[in-house]
C-alpha cells in the first residue's frame, strides 16, 4: 500500500537498518526509497526538546510486515518509502538549505559568486555529492563566498549542524543537469587498477555498470565474467574510484570487462531496471518466499509485486509435476544484489521490476520498429502528439513530443498568430487524424512557453514548451521520449526517424495516418554548404538524403526527430525549417535539442 504523507511527532519503533543525516524529512523519504531494503523511516527535526546531536538524523527501517509500531515523539517525523508506490520517483533535489552546514569530506574550496554557482560547480565535479556555501554575510571575512565541495561514502552528509549565514545543497547530477562527459564505452579484456570502494555480484557487465551508476561513490567499474579463471571472483563487480575521477591505468585481462558510471546521463538510460532474464543461472540470497509459478515471467511478476523481493530464481517444473508449475524463489540481500551467482543448475533468474519507476519513464522499451513502409502503426511513436487549433475551425497545426507528464516539446514557429493557449488541443496516442471526433479526449494547454530569443525559425531558438492543464497517464500508446544527455554531445546517432502528419510533397494536404521516414543526420558543415544564405548554428541539426526524396514537410513542424541509441529513443531534433520538401541537397533543419536541455529543465522543473 502506498502511503505518501508524513507522520508528524511520530516515531517508528525498531526495525533499524542504518542511520544517515538528511536536511529534511522529505529527503529522508527519498533516501529510504533508494535504499535497497528500507521500507519505513523516522526523521528527527531540529527542536529545543531534542538533543542537537540527533537533529537531522534519518533512521532507515525495514519490517517483514511492512509496518512498525508507532510511538509519539516530539520533533520526530516518520513515513514510508515510495517503493510501495507506483508513481515516478526522482532523486533530484534542487532545494537549498539555509543556515545548515552539511558535513562531509571537504575536498575542494574555491570562491563563488553565489550559492547557485557553487551548486553548478558541484554538479559538474565528478566527486561532488553536496556543498556548503558561506554567504557574504558570513562572520569570518576570509571564509565569505567560499564554496566547499564535499563527498562521503554514502552520498549523504556525515552530520548536519546549524550554522548562521551558510547555505547547503546537493549536486544536481540526478536532475540531468551535469555537463560531465558520459563515457558509455565498455572495454573488453580490461581491468581498471584503482581503489575498490565496494563489490557486488552481478550477472553481466551491464548490470554491473548500472549498479555503479547509482552507487554514490562509484566512478568506474571492473566486472569479472563467468569465464574468469579464478572461480571465487566470477561474476564479481568491483566498484571503483580514483582521485582524478578516471582510471589511473588499464590492464589487459582476458574475461574481464570495464566501464564507467553513467551518472551524468542516467536520466536517459535504465539504471535501476534490470529487466533481462539470466538462463541457467541461480541467484543466491536470503529467501523471502517460495511460490509456485507457471513461468519465469510469472515469477518476475510475483517478485515485483512483493515489496521486499529484490531478485528471484525460477526452477522450471519437472515434466507433469505440480500442474506444470515451477518453483519461484523470491529473494533479498542487504545490498539488493545476489550474494552469489551459480551457473549450470538450470535455474532462470532475474530482478524485481519494482525499481523501474526510479528510472525515467522514457527509457521503457517500446514495440519493435516496423521495418519498411511509410505509414506508422499504433504505439510505434508513443511520444508523438498532434497539436490542434480550434480557431477558426479545428485542424492539425503542428506535431509535438511528450517529454514529461505535463509537458510537450514543439517548435516556436507553430504559434505565429496564436493569441491564447485556450484555442489549442493536444491529442496523444493518435495514429489517424480521422480518429479525432467531437468527443475524443484531449489535453488542454495551460501555458505556451516560447524561447525568449526566438524571432523566426531560420535564425534558431525555434523551440517551445506546452504545459498541459492535466497530466498524461503513461500507457503503451502515450509515453515520453528521453531528452539527449549533455554529456552525450559526441554520440553519433545512426538510427534517426522523422514522423508527422504533414504534407508528403510541397503542394499537398495533411495526411490521415502518421507517416515515418528514416533519415540520416548531416554534419553542420555539410548543411551550411547547402544553405549558403543562412547561418547553420550549433543549435541546429540537419538531416536528409543527398538525393532528397525523404524529409519532413509542412505540418510536421514541431514534431520529433527521434534517434535510437543503446536501445533508448532520444529526442534529438524538433522539425523546424528547410528549403522546400525533400529537395536534392537541401536537408531538413531541426532544432538541436541537446543545446536546449538546460532551458527545458529550467522551465519544466521550476518550483
Amino acid at each position: 500500500e502506498c502511503v505518501t504523507q508524513l507522520l508528524k511527532d511520530t516515531c517508528f519503533e525498531g526495525g533499524d537498518i542504518t542511520t544517515v543525516f538528511t536536511p529534511s524529512a522529505k529527503y529522508c523519504q527519498v533516501v529510504c526509497t533508494y535504499h535497497p531494503r528500507c521500507l519505513l523511516f523516522t526523521f528527527t527535526a531540529e527542536s529545543p526538546s531534542e538533543d542537537p546531536t540527533r537533529w537531522f538524523t534519518c533512521v532507515l527501517k525495514d519490517s517483514v510486515t511492512e509496518t512498525l509500531p508507532r510511538v509519539n515523539r516530539t520533533a520526530a517525523i516518520s513515513g514510508y518509502s515510495f517503493k510501495q508506490c507506483s508513481h515516478q520517483i526522482s532523486a533530484c533535489n534542487k532545494d537549498i538549505y539555509v543556515d545548515l552546514d552539511m558535513k562531509g569530506i571537504n575536498y575542494n574550496s574555491s570562491v563563488a559568486k553565489s550559492a547557485q554557482e557553487c551548486q553548478e560547480r558541484c554538479t559538474d565535479d565528478v566527486h561532488c555529492h553536496f556543498f556548503t556555501y558561506a554567504t557574504r554575510q558570513f562572520p569570518s571575512l576570509e571564509h565569505r563566498n567560499i564554496c566547499l565541495l564535499k563527498h562521503t561514502q554514502t552520498g549523504t552528509p556525515t552530520r548536519i549542524t546549524k550554522l548562521d549565514k551558510v547555505v547547503s545543497g546537493f549536486s544536481l547530477k540526478s536532475c540531468a543537469l551535469s555537463n560531465l562527459a558520459c563515457i558509455r564505452d565498455i572495454f573488453p579484456n580490461t581491468v581498471f587498477a584503482d581503489s575498490n570502494i565496494d563489490s557486488v555480484m552481478a550477472p553481466d557487465a551491464f548490470v554491473c555498470g548500472r549498479i555503479c551508476t547509482h552507487h554514490p561513490g562509484c566512478l568506474f567499474f571492473t566486472f569479472f565474467s563467468q569465464e574468469w579463471p579464478k572461480e571465487s571472483q566470477r561474476n564479481l563487480c568491483l566498484l571503483k574510484t580514483s582521485e582524478s575521477g578516471l582510471p589511473s591505468t588499464r590492464i589487459k585481462k582476458s574475461k574481464a570487462l570495464s566501464g564507467f558510471s553513467l551518472q551524468s546521463c542516467r536520466h536517459s538510460i535504465p539504471v535501476f531496471c534490470h529487466s533481462s532474464f539470466y538462463h541457467d543461472t541461480d541467484f543466491l540470497g536470503e529467501e523471502l518466499d517460495i511460490v509456485a509459478a507457471k513461468s519465469h515471467e510469472a515469477c518476475q511478476k510475483l517478485c515485483t509485486n512483493a515489496v521486499r523481493c529484490q531478485f528471484f530464481t525460477y526452477t522450471p517444473a519437472q515434466a507433469s509435476c505440480n500442474e506444470g508449475k515451477g518453483k519461484c524463489y523470491l529473494k533479498l540481500s542487504s545490498n539488493g544484489s545476489p550474494t552469489k551467482i551459480l551457473h549450470g543448475r538450470g535455474g532462470i533468474s532475474g530482478y524485481t521490476l519494482r525499481l523501474c519507476k526510479m528510472d525515467n519513464e522514457c527509457t521503457t522499451k517500446i514495440k519493435p520498429r516496423i521495418v519498411g513502409g511509410t505509414a506508422s502503426v499504433r504505439g510505434e511513436w508513443p511520444w508523438q502528439v498532434t497539436l490542434h487549433t480550434t480557431s477558426p475551425t479545428q485542424r492539425h497545426l503542428c506535431g509535438g513530443s511528450i517529454i514529461g507528464n505535463q509537458w510537450i516539446l514543439t517548435a516556436a514557429h507553430c504559434f505565429y498568430g496564436v493569441e491564447s493557449p485556450k484555442i489549442l488541443r493536444v491529442y496523444s496516442g493518435i495514429l489517424n487524424q480521422s480518429e479525432i471526433k467531437e468527443d475524443t479526449s484531449f489535453f488542454g494547454v495551460q501555458e505556451i512557453i516560447i524561447h525568449d530569443q526566438y524571432k523566426m525559425a531560420e535564425s534558431g531558438y525555434d523551440i517551445a514548451l506546452l504545459k498541459l492543464e492535466t497530466t498524461v497517464n503513461y500507457t503503451d500508446s502515450q509515453r515520453p521520449i528521453c531528452l539527449p544527455s549533455k554529456g552525450d554531445r559526441n554520440v553519433i546517432y545512426t538510427d534517426c526517424w522523422v514522423t508527422g502528419w504533414g504534407y508528403r510533397k510541397l503542394r499537398d494536404k495533411i495526411q490521415n495516418t502518421l507517416q515515418k521516414a528514416k533519415i540520416p543526420l548531416v554534419t553542420n558543415e555539410e548543411c551550411q554548404k547547402r544553405y549558403r544564405g543562412h547561418k547553420i548554428t550549433h543549435k541546429m541539426i540537419c538531416a536528409g538524403y543527398r538525393e532528397g526524396g525523404k524529409d519532413a514537410c509542412k505540418g510536421d513542424s514541431g514534431g520529433p526527430l527521434s534517434c535510437k541509441h543503446n536501445e533508448v529513443w532520444h529526442l534529438v531534433g524538433i522539425t523546424s525549417w528547410g528549403e522546400g520538401c525533400a529537395q536534392r541537397e537541401r536537408p531538413g533543419v531541426y532544432t538541436n535539442v541537446v543545446e536546449y536541455v538546460d532551458w527545458i529543465l529550467e522551465k519544466t522543473q521550476a518550483v
Epitope: A181, C182, F187, N189, T249, K252, F260, N490, V491
Partner: antibody, heavy 118, light 107 residues
Amino acid sequence: EVQLLESGGGLVQPGGSLRLSCAASGFTFSDYEMAWVRQAPGKGLEWVSSIVPSGGWTLYADSVKGRFTISRDNSKNTLYLQMNSLRAEDTAVYYCATWGDSWGFDFWGQGTLVTVSS
Amino acid sequence: DIQMTQSPSSVSASVGDRVTITCRASQGISSWLAWYQQKPGKAPKLLIYDASTLQSGVPSRFSGSGSGTDFTLTINSLQPEDFATYYCQQADSFPIAFGQGTRLEIK
C-alpha cells in the same frame, strides 16, 4: 577499405604549437578507440596518446602530458592532436592508428612529419 | 612502467633462412605482446597479437611464442619482402611501450 590520412605537420619553432588532424574512412569511426604514435628520425616507435570512442577518456605518455591534447569529432570522422610548448625532441613522424580489442594498433595512417627547430 | 628490450638490434639473413627475434619485458606481461613490421618510409603493420595470434592476411611463415617476460618472433623461410624492421609492443597495460626495433637485412 580502412584509410587514415594525417595532416597538419610542418616546421615549428620551439615553444610553438601545431594541430594535427587524421581523417578516417572505410570503417565506423565512432566505434573505435584511436591513438597517436610517433617515430623520431632513425628511431623506434613511441606511443603518444589514446582516446576512447566516446571521446570522454584520454591517456597520454608522460613525455607529452600537459602539453598535448588528443580529441575527436565523431561527426566528422576526424582525430586531432593539439601540440603546445613543442620541444626539439618532439620532432618525429606522427602516425594516427586504430587501437583494437587485441590491444594492438590494427591500422595506421601514412604519417605526417613534425619538425621542431629554430 | 613496463620496458621492452629487443635483441638483436640487427640481423643479417638470406632468402629461405629461418630467423628468430627475441623481446624481453621488464616484468611479466602474460601473453600480451604484439609484433609489427615496418618498411622504410612506410607505416608499421600489425603481424601478431596475444604473443602468437596471427593478424588476418599475415603469411603463416610468421609465428610468435612466449609468455611472462620472454617472447620470440620467428620467420620461417624468409622472403624478399620480409626484409624490414620489426618491433614488439607490450599490450599488458598503459602506458603502451615498444621495443627499440630489430633491423632484418639481406646478408
